[in-house]
């Protein structure tokens, strides 16, 4: 059956031979209605990429550099399956390119000019492409030929395989630049030896190189890693201090109609029957005909790449930046230490309008980018299409797991002028009911619930976390008879109460009328039994404070809070009747942009913050008529975090633990991708 066939692309006679053997052996173990292999032979990996894009083939395994080529238009391929190395219990699908230095030296990443450098080899990922790509815009002009620019940047180097005649400085630390193990400074171990011997000041290698060459921890402690934020970390902190994370070897397919499920079904079956130590007749990860045919010989198996993970996310911002710099050879005109405009991520067109107005008022210091969901915005910040946004704590957690950092906190209670330097304790997550109902925390089963959105703190993580510890399962849509929790599956009972309008029904953005704090409260007013919101929501939307038709006649005393002990209290008593304390919303950004974002926002709030009194004829950053666009409307200021500058420290141990527990109920495709 052609639609059940995976056309594998082979790039040599030897690969084609192995592919045919793969095809025949799979035929013998799979049912006739299962997936099958067909082989397509092409002259090169680039030809395979083009063939897949043109629907003449379906899959090929590529190294990271080629995954980048495959992702570029017009190819638009995406990673679908990753080879893993190491054990099944601790599968490694990536390695980290690092810059290693001796602990007793005192320079940072931005002080490499004039130092001596050790590289694994010319054109190699960890040893050349990544470090030189990231340093590209600091190299002296003209930057072509690249080897000459690098030779003029460092005071001496060992770059195995470089042309020692044309670029003698590149071979200064290893005469002749030998391109094999005859050169003592060749490849990973060689580059590390070059540093260890004192020939060089920095070695560009893989994170595992240090461990492979120094078994003794005391010896490893003599070395450190240079981080991109111009700090240093110990060699075992490579996950938080690397130049780039590099995928090892990846199967790619078309982004649309790419047969990814079929490819996974095929490879999963293949590893079961012909993986490491599985069969004598045919081995997926070795071949008598040559090395690394179709798959790497060192691979131990396959893992399915999460569906939310596109090539940009898979390759990572640093890797793409490095490769793009090298390939395109373009650098910003502004010096790199100058802050470029900050691209704010706006959710749907309501936030985009406010962002556009901000952009005009900021004289272009703020630019705007849009996405339809918070998770899409986070992904855009990760890959550099946007720079920053303000997030509820639940999304600060996801953003943190995806490598972003908190930059400033929204403060709601501290009056100026102390606001900017005050760390607030947070707000209360509460459960609101109508005073006329007889509901308590203990009899919510079968009732109608209203949530700000799935994954948000007050509307989801806190109440559902508490509920989970009571019911011990994740079927929240069965616990409540119906509800509105924007971001739920469209056919779920937790989308039944949502108001839409239609194509936007239950979408986690402002196009859904019951989205956010105000939306969840409106859902309670119009349809629901209980709303999970922040403690300020009822006072902010009653007593005529919200002029919208549905809210203008509401009275605060018509609503009460549910307490965890089964009692109820007035909405004026959240301190004595709440579900938990929630961390304030916070602005997040990529690490490399955090300082610029902070500086710019502090400047912007001085002009457009809560000191502006007349918002009808002036732009106000923290005002959107109860709709919490870009920031919560009750924000007094954006406050510095001081030492709370990681998502764990910002959110606090208790909240992180609660959200981590809820992860077994997670419906976050982005979180799944970021923890791959």
């Amino acid at each position: 059956v052609p639609e059940k066939s995976v056309r594998w692309c082979a790039v040599s006679e030897h690969e084609a031979t192995k592919c045919q053997s793969f095809r025949d052996h799979m035929k013998s173990v799979l049912p006739s209605n299962g997936p099958s292999v067909a082989c397509v032979k092409k002259a090169s990996h680039l030809d395979c990429i083009r063939a897949i894009a043109a629907n003449e083939a379906d899959a090929v395994t590529l190294d990271a550099g080629l995954v980048y080529d495959a992702y570029l238009a017009p190819n638009n391929l995406k990673p679908v399956v990753a080879e893993f190395y190491g054990s099944k219990e601790d599968p490694q699908t990536f390695y980290y390119a690092v810059a290693v230095v001796k602990k007793d030296s005192d320079f940072q990443m931005n002080q490499l000019r004039g130092r001596k450098s050790c590289h694994t080899g010319l054109g190699r990922s960890a040893g050349w492409n990544i470090p030189i790509g990231l340093l590209y815009c600091d190299l002296p002009e003209p930057r072509k030929p690249l080897e000459k620019a690098v030779a003029n940047f460092f005071s001496g180097s060992c770059v195995p395989c470089a042309d020692g005649t044309d670029f003698p400085q590149l071979c200064q630390l290893c005469p002749g630049c030998g391109c094999s193990t005859l050169n003592q400074y060749f490849s990973y171990s060689g580059a590390f030896k070059c540093l260890k011997d004192g020939a060089g000041d920095v070695a560009f290698v893989k994170h595992s190189t240090i461990f492979e060459n120094l078994a003794n921890k005391a010896d490893r402690d003599q070395y450190e890693l240079l981080c991109l934020d111009n700090t240093r970390k110990s060699v075992d902190e490579y996950k938080d201090c690397h130049l780039a994370r590099v995928p090892s070897h990846t199967v790619v397919a078309r982004s649309v109609g790419g047969k990814e499920d079929l490819i996974w079904e095929l490879l999963n079956q293949a590893q079961e029957h012909f993986g490491k130590d599985k069969s004598k007749e045919f081995q997926l990860f070795s071949s008598p005909h040559g090395k690394d045919l179709l798959f790497k010989d060192s691979a131990h198996g396959f893992l399915k790449v999460p569906p939310r993970m596109d090539a940009k996310m898979y390759l990572g911002y640093e890797y793409i930046t490095a490769i793009r710099n090298l390939r395109e050879g373009t650098c910003p005109e502004a010096p790199t230490d100058e802050c470029k405009p900050v691209k704010w991520c706006a959710l749907s067109h309501h936030e985009r309008l406010k962002c556009d107005e901000w952009s005009v008022n900021s004289a272009g210091k703020i630019e705007c980018e849009s996405a339809e969901t918070t998770e899409d915005c986070i992904a855009k910040i990760m890959n550099g299409e946007a720079d920053a946004m303000s997030l509820d704590g639940g999304f600060v957690y996801i953003a943190g797991m995806c490598g972003l950092v908190p930059v400033l906190a929204e403060n709601y209670n501290t009056p100026n002028p102390n606001c900017e330097n005050t760390a607030e304790e947070g707000y209360f997550a509460v459960a609101v009911v109508k005073s006329s109902s007889d509901l308590t925390w203990d009899n919510l089963k079968g009732k109608k619930s209203c949530h700000t959105a799935v994954g948000r703190t007050a509307g989801w993580n806190i109440p559902m976390g508490l509920l989970y510890s009571k019911i011990n399962h994740c079927r929240f849509d069965e616990f409540f008879s119906e509800g509105c929790a924007p971001g739920s599956e469209k056919n779920s009972s937790l989308c039944k109460l949502c108001m839409g309008p239609s194509p936007n029904l239950c979408e986690p953005n402002n196009k859904e009328g019951y989205y956010g704090y105000t939306g969840a409260f409106r859902c309670l007013v119009e349809k629901g039994d209980v709303a999970f919101v922040k403690h300020q929501t009822v006072p902010q939307n009653t007593g005529g404070k919200n002029p919208d038709a549905w809210a203008k006649n509401l009275k605060e005393e018509d609503y009460e809070l549910l307490c965890l002990d089964g009692s109820r209290k007035s909405v004026q008593e959240p301190a004595n009747c709440h579900l938990a304390r929630a961390p304030n919303h916070a602005v997040v950004a990529r690490k490399d942009k955090a300082d610029c974002v902070q500086t710019l926002l502090l400047d912007q709030q001085r002009m457009f913050g809560s000191s502006v009194t007349d918002c009808s004829s002036n732009f106000c950053l923290f005002e959107s008529k109860t709709k919490d666009l870009l920031f919560r409307d009750d924000t007094v200021c954006l406050a510095k975090l001081h030492d709370r500058n990681t998502y764990e420290k910002y959110l606090g141990e208790e909240y992180v633990k609660a959200v981590t527990n809820l992860r077994k109920c997670s419906t976050s495709p982005l979180l799944e991708a970021c923890t791959f």
């Epitope: 309501h350 107005e357 008022n361 004829s617 732009f619």
Partner: nanobody
């Protein structure tokens, strides 16, 4: 609430010029930010240019150096001078004063600009 009416669009050849006007039914002197947006078929509405009461301006990258936004508070009118027009400038152009609730999806009729040879 001030009503806004756009005019000045039309068919023009590539390289040509047009001047769009947006007349307000009341005073725009106290309105802080005004802007021109455009929407091509099947595309999202996008900001073209904006201007504040103090005269600070912002342009989309695609129109920088070709379009000029200005306002005349005495005449209660917002303008967009469009030079060196390109086929990709073809769209319906709208003006807004941002004074409405961001939530109200209110836009006028707009004015059609077609750049074609």
């Amino acid at each position: 609430e001030v009503q806004l009416v756009e005019c000045g669009g039309g068919l023009v050849q590539p390289g040509g010029s047009l001047r769009l006007s947006c007349a307000a039914s009341g005073s725009i002197a106290s309105i802080n930010t005004m802007a021109w947006y455009r929407q091509a078929p099947g595309q999202q509405r996008e900001l073209v240019a904006g201007i504040t009461r103090g005269g600070s301006t912002k342009y989309a990258d695609s129109v920088k150096g070709r379009f000029t936004i200005s306002r005349d508070n005495a005449k209660n009118t917002l303008y967009l001078q469009m030079n060196s027009l390109k086929p990709e400038d073809t769209a319906v152009y709208y003006c807004t004063d941002f004074s409405r609730d961001y939530y109200q999806d209110y836009w006028g009729q707009g004015t059609q600009v077609t750049v074609s040879s």
